[in-house]
Structures are given as structure tokens and as C-alpha cells.
């Protein structure tokens, strides 16, 4: 697994830098939580077609994943700072059991897909305490998501596989705007 | 052949409106972010705006917010560049770019730049 | 807009020189800024990205190196070839440049 956000060497050569702001610690997070995807993403697209295949849509079906737009207050234009960072921590929130399901579909890449995990529930601890209206994410049903898990999990082999591209390939597109707007508040 | 091919530069007077296009062959822009940047005659690069392929997010420089409007057709692997109120100061060669990865973009691919002239 | 400042504007050197260049970010932008190198009557071209990393097939010579808002572009034996104008871009938001340094011979 990569070395954890203020841990890699360049921190360690120059004890003397200032601490990391709230804000460069969720950016160096975000970036943190990318470069463990495009690992996990090398795996899926090396162990199979998926990642050129063009069925997407078939196994899309099945998925409910988050995705920004325009009214979520996040782009340039509307640019909504809290109406953004609640819908950042709700996409957050939903992309949690996506990826529990990612968890055991990875060989060589297991702890890597871990760590992902992890450091989304960090990412999400960040951003709550910089959310002032907390009262305005809603978290997904447990109840709800055990159900999906079950559902992901009995599909096909090549469903599976596909399942797996698709949460990689949205988490990437979610993080990677989520990122853009975080770095206009 | 990975390339950007521009078209759509020209002669129009002050208040005008013109649209730039850039044509992508060898990847496709629907996967990723794709940028303008211009550069007046004898004076440095400007950056105009990029556009994020993920939900065609747009970003602009605040020198043209308002009036220029960047877009794509993914069909046609087309970015375009629509400049309304035209002015002077918007003279020089309009670079169409691809940003080359995804949370610490530089711009690894160019295309050959096409002229507007904003006069009257 | 996050403003990139380069300096200096204009560097007279000779071939064989050492030579830098410096560029300042009006906000902190981590290490996301490339260096550019551009001749006349041609698209630029990037030499250095994420503050430090040397682009593919670019010499040595070149280096970079800053984080933050403090960068710097260095060449450690100038080339004829070297005889250019460089741009400083940021990426954190947008994509800004600096005003460029043409540098030219002595």
C-alpha cells in the first residue's frame, strides 16, 4: 500500500515545513485516495477487458453510483461552497458500500483496496468537521446496503468484473471533482 | 496519429462573436480534460478555460468569464470555443490543449494554434 | 485567478552558463506546476511537471524543483538550443501562467 498522506519522504527530509492546513490535508487525502485507485484500476484493466469494453451500460443498471452535477452546487458556475460540501459527503457516504464490495476482489492488490477504504472514512471525518450544516447529509440505510452488497455479490463472473471497473472508474470521476470544487472553498 | 486540429480563427470587428473548434483524432476527449490558452502577438500564454470530461465540468479565467463558453461534442471527439462581445484586448493565437493526467494536469499535447483578430 | 509570478523577465546568458528561474504563486498550488519552453512561432512545450519530474526525452540539463508558492526552473549547462522563452503554469485551479522569462544570449 502507498505511504499514508504525511508520511512520504519529502515530509520526512524537511521536519521544518509548516504543518498542513485543513484544507491541504483533505486535497493531499483526496490525491492520496487517487493514486490507490489508479493501482486498483491497473489490476481490473490487466486481469481483463472491461476497462475498453463497451457493455457498461448492461452492469450500470444494477448501480445506483453517486455522480456530480449541476444543480449539486460544486462547478464553477452556481458555485455553492455548503450546498458542494454536502453533497461531497453524501457521495461519500453512498460510495461506502461499493466499496465494502471492492474488498474482495483484488489479489495482489488487497491491501491496496483497504487502504482505499480507509481513507475514504478519514476523508469523510475531514470534511464533516468543515460541513456547518450536518444536519443535511443523509446517511444510507444499513439495512439498504446489505441488501445491494448481497445483490453485487451474487451477480455473474463478468458482471462482477464489470461491477468492479464501474465503481473504480466513478469513485475516480467523484473524487476528482470533488477535489476541483474543494479547492475553491 | 494522436493530434489537435484547429479550426475556426479570423477577421471580426469589436462585439462579434466567432467559435472556435479543435478536432481530437488518436484518443478521445470524453476522457479527458481539455484546455484553450491564447497568447497575444508578441506577449505570453494566457490560460482561457478547460473543461473536465466528467459531467464536461467548465472552469474559466476570469478575463473572459461571461463570455466565452467552452463546450465538446463527444461524438464528433470536438471541442469548441464560442467567444461572444469580442474585444481588442481578445486579439492573438487561440491554443487548443490536452491536460495530461488527472489531479496535477500539465499539458502535454498542443495544437498548432489559430489566429483571431478582433478589429475594426 | 491564482497569479503566477516569473522573474526575471529577460536573462542574458552565454552557452555553457548555468541559469535559473523563479516563480511565485499568489496561493499555495502543493507541486502542481509545469515549465514550458517556447520558440517563435511554435506551440510551447513542456520540459518539467508536478514541480520536479522531467518530461520524457527532455535533457537532463533541466531540473525543477519548489512547493507551495516557491518554484524554480534550472538549467545547468545552457545550449544553444536553450534559447527560448519559459512560461511557469499552475494546475491547482485552472491553469495560469507566469508572464514567461525570454532568455537570451549574451
Known amino acids: 500500500a502507498p505511504v499514508p498522506p504525511g508520511e512520504d519522504s519529502k515530509d520526512v527530509a524537511a521536519p521544518h515545513r509548516q504543518p498542513l492546513t485543513s484544507s491541504e490535508r483533505i486535497d493531499k487525502q483526496i490525491r492520496y485516495i487517487l493514486d490507490g485507485i489508479s493501482a486498483l484500476r491497473k489490476e481490473t484493466c490487466n486481469k481483463s477487458n472491461m476497462c475498453e469494453s463497451s457493455k457498461e451500460a448492461l452492469a450500470e443498471n444494477n448501480l445506483n453510483l453517486p455522480k456530480m452535477a449541476e444543480k449539486d452546487g460544486c462547478f464553477q458556475s452556481g458555485f455553492n461552497e455548503e450546498t458542494c460540501l454536502v453533497k461531497i459527503i453524501t457521495g461519500l457516504l453512498e460510495f461506502e458500500v461499493y466499496l465494502e464490495y471492492l474488498q474482495n476482489r483484488f489479489e495482489s492488490s488487497e491491501e491496496q483496496a483497504r487502504a482505499v477504504q480507509m481513507s475514504t472514512k478519514v476523508l469523510i471525518q475531514f470534511l464533516q468537521k468543515k460541513a456547518k450544516n450536518l444536519d443535511a447529509i443523509t446517511t444510507p440505510d444499513p439495512t439498504t446496503n446489505a441488501s445491494l452488497l448481497t445483490k453485487l455479490q451474487a451477480q455473474n463472473q463478468w458482471l462482477q468484473d464489470m461491477t468492479t471497473h464501474l465503481i473504480l472508474r466513478s469513485f475516480k470521476e467523484f473524487l476528482q471533482s470533488s477535489l476541483r470544487a474543494l479547492r475553491q472553498m | 496519429e494522436v493530434q489537435l486540429v484547429q479550426s475556426g480563427g479570423g477577421l471580426i470587428q469589436p462585439g462579434g462573436s466567432l467559435r472556435l473548434s479543435c478536432a481530437a483524432s488518436?484518443?478521445?476527449?470524453?476522457?479527458?480534460?481539455m484546455i484553450w490558452v491564447r497568447q497575444a502577438p508578441g506577449k505570453g500564454l494566457e490560460w482561457v478555460s478547460d473543461?473536465?470530461?466528467?459531467?464536461?465540468?467548465?472552469y474559466y479565467a476570469d478575463s473572459v468569464k461571461g463570455r466565452f463558453t467552452m463546450s465538446r461534442d463527444i461524438s464528433k471527439n470536438t471541442v469548441y470555443l464560442q467567444m461572444n462581445s469580442l474585444r481588442a484586448e481578445d486579439t492573438g493565437v487561440y491554443y487548443c490543449?490536452?491536460?495530461?493526467?488527472?489531479?496535477?494536469?500539465?499539458?502535454?499535447?498542443w495544437g498548432r494554434g489559430t489566429l483571431v483578430t478582433v478589429s475594426s | 485567478d491564482i497569479v503566477m509570478t516569473q522573474s526575471p523577465s529577460t536573462l542574458s546568458a552565454s552557452v555553457g552558463d548555468r541559469v535559473t528561474i523563479t516563480c511565485r504563486a499568489s496561493?499555495?498550488?502543493?507541486?502542481?506546476l509545469a515549465w514550458y519552453q517556447q520558440k517563435p512561432g511554435r506551440a510551447p512545450k513542456v520540459l518539467i511537471y508536478?514541480?520536479?519530474t522531467l518530461e520524457s526525452g527532455v535533457p537532463s540539463r533541466f531540473s525543477g524543483s519548489g512547493s507551495g508558492t516557491d518554484f524554480t526552473l534550472t538549467i545547468s549547462s545552457l545550449q544553444p538550443e536553450d534559447f527560448a522563452t519559459y512560461y511557469c503554469?499552475?494546475?491547482?485551479?485552472?491553469?495560469?501562467f507566469g508572464q514567461g522569462t525570454k532568455l537570451e544570449i549574451k
Open positions: 488518436g484518443f478521445t476527449i470524453s476522457s479527458n480534460y
Open positions: 508536478k514541480a520536479s
Open positions: 473543461l473536465y470530461y466528467y459531467a464536461g465540468d467548465t
Open positions: 496561493q499555495g498550488i502543493s507541486s502542481w
Open positions: 490543449a490536452r491536460w495530461a493526467d488527472d489531479h496535477a494536469p500539465w499539458v502535454d499535447l
Open positions: 503554469q499552475q494546475s491547482w485551479l485552472g491553469g495560469s
